[in-house]
Each structure stands twice: as C-alpha cells, then as structure tokens.
Amino acid sequence: QRFAQAQQQLPLESLGWDVAELQLNHTGPQQDPRLYWQGGPALGRSFLHGPELDKGQLRIHRDGIYMVHIQVTLAICSSTTASRHHPTTLAVGICSPASRSISLLRLSFHQGCTIASQRLTPLARGDTLCTNLTGTLLPSRNTDETFFGVQWVRP
Amino acid sequence: QRFAQAQQQLPLESLGWDVAELQLNHTGPQQDPRLYWQGGPALGRSFLHGPELDKGQLRIHRDGIYMVHIQVTLAICSSTTASRHHPTTLAVGICSPASRSISLLRLSFHQGCTIASQRLTPLARGDTLCTNLTGTLLPSRNTDETFFGVQWVRP
Amino acid sequence: QRFAQAQQQLPLESLGWDVAELQLNHTGPQQDPRLYWQGGPALGRSFLHGPELDKGQLRIHRDGIYMVHIQVTLAICSSTTASRHHPTTLAVGICSPASRSISLLRLSFHQGCTIASQRLTPLARGDTLCTNLTGTLLPSRNTDETFFGVQWVRP
C-alpha cells in the first residue's frame, strides 16, 4: 500500500509526527524562573500535535529523537540594558521525572536582547521540558519574538 | 508494500517532502525593505523542491507545518556599527495573500552582526513569505553567511 | 502494508533517518583551528545513527539534503572578552573530499559568547564536515552549551 494512502488511512500521530510550537503565556512567580507556555489554534499560530501542556510546561508523549528549538526576546531591552542586567540566561531542560533531570540547551544574552538556538536530543514519553529564564528582565510575549517548540525526528 | 519501495515508486513531492534553501540575490529599491532571494543548483548549494520563487519571494505549494529558518549577516559591521545604525531588524512573515499577512519571526541585530533563528509554523498553499530588513545596512551575499529556507514537517 | 508496520520491519537506516548529535571532545593542536567532536550514549545525550566520526570529524554515509545545526559557547567569556579577542569566527564546511571543499555556515561572535545557527544543505556519502574556530578563545565543553548535529531531511 502506498505511503500517500497510508497517510490518509492512519492518524498522523501513529506515524510519529509529534510536533508542538508554543507561545509565551507568562513568567513564574518569585523564586520560579520557569517560563509558562500556551498553545493552540485559538491563540494564533501555536499548536500541539502529540505533546501536551502540563501547567504551562511541555510534556512529551512519544519516545524518540526530537529537534528542540527556542527563541526568547527580552521585552524592554537595548545592548546596554542586557549588559547591565547580565547575566540573563535561558536554559531548556528535562525537569521531570526528577530521575531524568538534565539541562539540554543553555544560552546567555550578554549584550544582545534575543537568543535563539536548536538541538537534537533523545526524549522519552513523560519527559517534561522546562525553560528557565534567570535574571530580572521580562521576556516579550510577542508571538514572533518568543516561541518554543519540538519536532519528533526519528525513533 | 515497503516504504523503501514506495520511495522509489512515488515522486518525492507526493510524499510531502517540500523543502527549499535560498541565497540572497539583492535588496529592494527605496522604500522596499524586502530581501530578494534566488535558488537553484546552478547557483551553488541552494535549491527549491516544491516551493517556488515569485519575484524573489518564496511561495509555498503544499499545506502543512513547516520549519522556517534564516541567517542574515551584515556586509560590513562591528558591534559599534550595529548599535550606531540601530534598530536594524529582520522579520520573516507571510506577506500574501493579504488576508493571511502576519509576522512569523523577528530579531534585532543590537550589537551583533549576524542573526539566526528558526521556528515551526503552519503554512498554506499560496502563502508567500517575505523577509524584511529594516535600516540602511547592506547584507552579505556570501552563501555561508546569509540564507533562508523552509522544510515541510507534517500535514 | 502500513508505514507503522514498515517501521518495525525495516532497519531505520534504510528509511533514510540518518541523524547525529555530537558534543565537543577537544580543540586541535596549534595551527589546527578544527573542533574535535565525540558522540555516543555512553557520553550522555549525544549519538550517531548513520553518520560516523573520523578522527573527531563527522562523515556522512547517505546522500541527501541535511539540516546542519551548531551551537558553540566560549568558555571564559564576557561581552568585553569577546570584543577584545574579537573577531572569533566559527565556520562549518565540507573539508573532504578536497574536490567538494566549501564553507557551509559562518558566524562571528562579536560581543556575544555564543553562536547558534542551522541550515539545509545537500551532502553526499563520504563528505566530511569540519568546524573551524578561529581566534584564541576556548570553547566550552558543557554539553548544553556546545554541540553540533545533522539530520537527514530528504533525498
């Protein structure tokens, strides 16, 4: 049977095409450096096909290797602001289950106001990804400036 | 029938593997902040498999979720240049049809001379992507410094 | 036969899902600007499925279009350090066979301490990718700060 037909017959999730793109909802309360995300067509161009949100954090539903990407832009920022409030750092990691806790991706803003990166990493069903923004500067909630996503690549 | 065989029998486009990587052709005339792109094997390592170029702008041929990525390097630049000519900003968006016009990705150069980012976004057949570079600085046309591409990820 | 079944029956490599994510092993001796990489589950979250390492450089095993991505963070670095030692430049290219030698991706650190980018590029079986870091600053070997990977996208 042809792949093109298989596409029509099978739910996409069974093909392993898990993917999500999230927009910033809000930052955490004091002492909580996490960014809280939201996604779904009602919100614009964000979506979750497979992964789910758990209290604003992204939970993986399928084992595999994923491409994880993120961009965060600071809201009121110039190169002077960024260096004065330095170090402002963004880290993406597995925050639960605790046994799998690890930092996957880390960047500092230095004299810039935007960081953007991506990497391939193995993730397992149940892994929850957290994005920690240290420092006092607020991230922009503009959907073209701050976003976070994952794409399943292979088993 | 096996997927490996299906690959041989079906044209790749029918598998939904639309992909393009473009190199900078030229900047726009006065009052036109758009970058104009070109692609094809005769030009080096750029290519279009599915999407097409329409007057230097990238037009999508297949509905789906795409990974959009871009890197732009300014042709002569230092941390002083970038801050002196600030704000120099790069925005990638859907510019037509007008009803779907939206900014997808935005970065400022601040004290840097290169921006690079990527994101997942839903695109529809007929969407044209434009890349707007504000400010007066010239982008480099070196193919390893400035490029723009899309990759179909899933329906 | 369904794609989901085909996944179980065929080795993944025959589906063209070549992918690798590497971590920094060490820098080269004097006059050798190359970064030397390592990968494998014993080392943490790095892996090679298809491509191989040849003396710390990544060798491609399957023709196709690949997404190449990299992040490099300088080890002892502030915006002042970066600008004083500036410009430190990172280039990713095909270094062998010599007949296919070309720079694919190039970025300067300017006043930042991390560069990150990605691009789509055609690669052929036997192509070896090298990552050259010019300048005197040392890259961080933290696996969440410095990494390099490729993902096969389509034939």
Epitope: - | T27, P29, Q30, Q31, I76, L137 | H86
Partner: antibody, heavy 120, light 107 residues
Framework: EVQLLESGGGLVQPGGSLRLSCAAS????????MSWVRQVPGKGLEWVSV????????DYADSVKGRFTISRDNSKNTLYLQMNSLRAEDTAVYYC?????????????WGQGTLVTVSS | DIQMTQSPSSLSASVGDRVSITCRAS??????LNWYQQKPGKAPKLLIY???SLQSGVPSRFSGSGSGTDFTLTISSLQPEDFATYYC?????????FGGGTKVEIK
C-alpha cells in the same frame, strides 16, 4: 570589460554644490553595490559612501553625512554623488568603485577618478 | 573607526628582490584585510582580498598573509611594473579604512 568613468569634477567655492557621475559598462550594473572613495592629491584614500545595487540602502562616512547624497539610475547604468555645502577639506580626486559581488566592502574595479577642488 | 598603520611608508628595492609590506589594525579584524596597488595618476587596483585570496588576473608573485591585527603583503620577485604605492584596507568594520600607503621605489 568592466569600465567605470567619472565626470562632473571641477572648481567650486566653499559652500557650493557639485554633482559627480560615474558611467558603468561591461557588467550588470544593478547587481552590484557601488561606493565613492576619495583621495587628497598625494595623500591616502578615504571611503565616502555606499549604495546597494537596487538603490534602497545607503551609508555615509561621518565626515560627509548630511551634506552628500549617493544615488543611482540603473536604467542609465550611472552612479551619482550630490555634494552640497562643500568645504576646503572635500578637495580630492573622487573615485567610483564597484564592490565585490558578496557586498563585502572591498572594491574590485575602480574608475580613473575626477578631481574636485573647493577653493575661493 | 579602526586605524590602519602601514610600514614602511616607503622602500627602495631592485628588480628580483623579495619585498614585504606590513599593515597593522588598531583592533582585531579577523581576515577582513585587502591590498591595493596604485600607480601615479591611476586608480587603485585590487590585488588581495580577505587577507590571502589573490584577485583574478593578479600575478602569483603577490601573496598576502596574517589575521587579527597583523598582516603582510609579499612580492616574491619584484618586477619593473610593480613599482607603485600599496594600500591596505580593512573591510571588517564601518567605515572601511585604508592605511597610509607604502611607496615602492627603484633602488
């Protein structure tokens, strides 16, 4: 063969204006960024201004900003430099120069130059 | 602005000599360094770009080296037509700036 030919130089009083032209041939003019570079007779070279191939992007040396305007007419394959509020220190041979295709700031072809003298 | 300093400002040499001219930038410019030759009453001519790349049509006796702040233009065997003034130029940071020139004269 790539050729660049400047014209429009001459003697002008301080505060006066002059318009230089550079006629280009032998290449696709609209595909290349162009610059003006000047040289005080017997002295070194100084970059003055740049314009992108399509004419949409320009930049100037601080010494001429606000007084000089670079422009181009791609239909006539001609580059211009409008010089206003001229000063004695603007006296120089003015060259038009073509940028390498990459837009990077090195100049692979130059014209023969036109002399501008600002004096009362 | 980045200052470019050339040395020597002039030198005398004979046909067949190996000649080296140095250029120093006031800050690191990576390999964004170009060399030009100018003869009296003529326009400059690009010889070397990106520190060491030979411009098309330029004889192979001309070579460039260096990175960071220190650069060298070498003429391996001076020919009669090489007597001219040579300028370095940085294309790293705006505005692009030139060295003061080195005049190569016949001994």
């Amino acid at each position: 063969e790539v050729q660049l030919l400047e014209s429009g130089g001459g003697l002008v009083q301080p505060g006066g204006s002059l318009r230089l032209s550079c006629a280009a041939s032998g290449f696709t003019f609209s595909s290349y960024a162009m610059s003006w570079v000047r040289q005080v007779p017997g002295k070194g070279l100084e970059w003055v201004s740049v314009i992108s191939g399509s004419g949409g992007r320009t930049d100037y040396a601080d010494s001429v900003k606000g007084r000089f305007t670079i422009s181009r007419d791609n239909s006539k394959n001609t580059l211009y430099l409008q010089m206003n509020s001229l000063r004695a220190e603007d006296t120089a041979v003015y060259y038009c120069a073509r940028h390498d295709y990459s837009n990077r700031f090195y100049f692979d072809y130059w014209g023969q130059g036109t002399l501008v003298t600002v004096s009362s | 602005d980045i200052q470019m300093t050339q040395s020597p400002s002039s030198l005398s040499a004979s046909v067949g000599d190996r000649v080296s001219i140095t250029c120093r930038a006031s800050q690191s410019i990576s390999s964004y360094l170009n060399w030009y030759q100018q003869k009296p009453g003529k326009a400059p001519k690009l010889l070397i770009y990106a520190a060491s790349s030979l411009q098309s049509g330029v004889p192979s006796r001309f070579s460039g080296s260096g990175s960071g702040t220190d650069f060298t233009l070498t003429i391996s065997s001076l020919q009669p037509e090489d007597f001219a003034t040579y300028y370095c130029q940085q294309s790293y940071s705006a505005p692009p700036t030139f060295g003061g020139g080195t005049k190569v004269e016949i001994k």
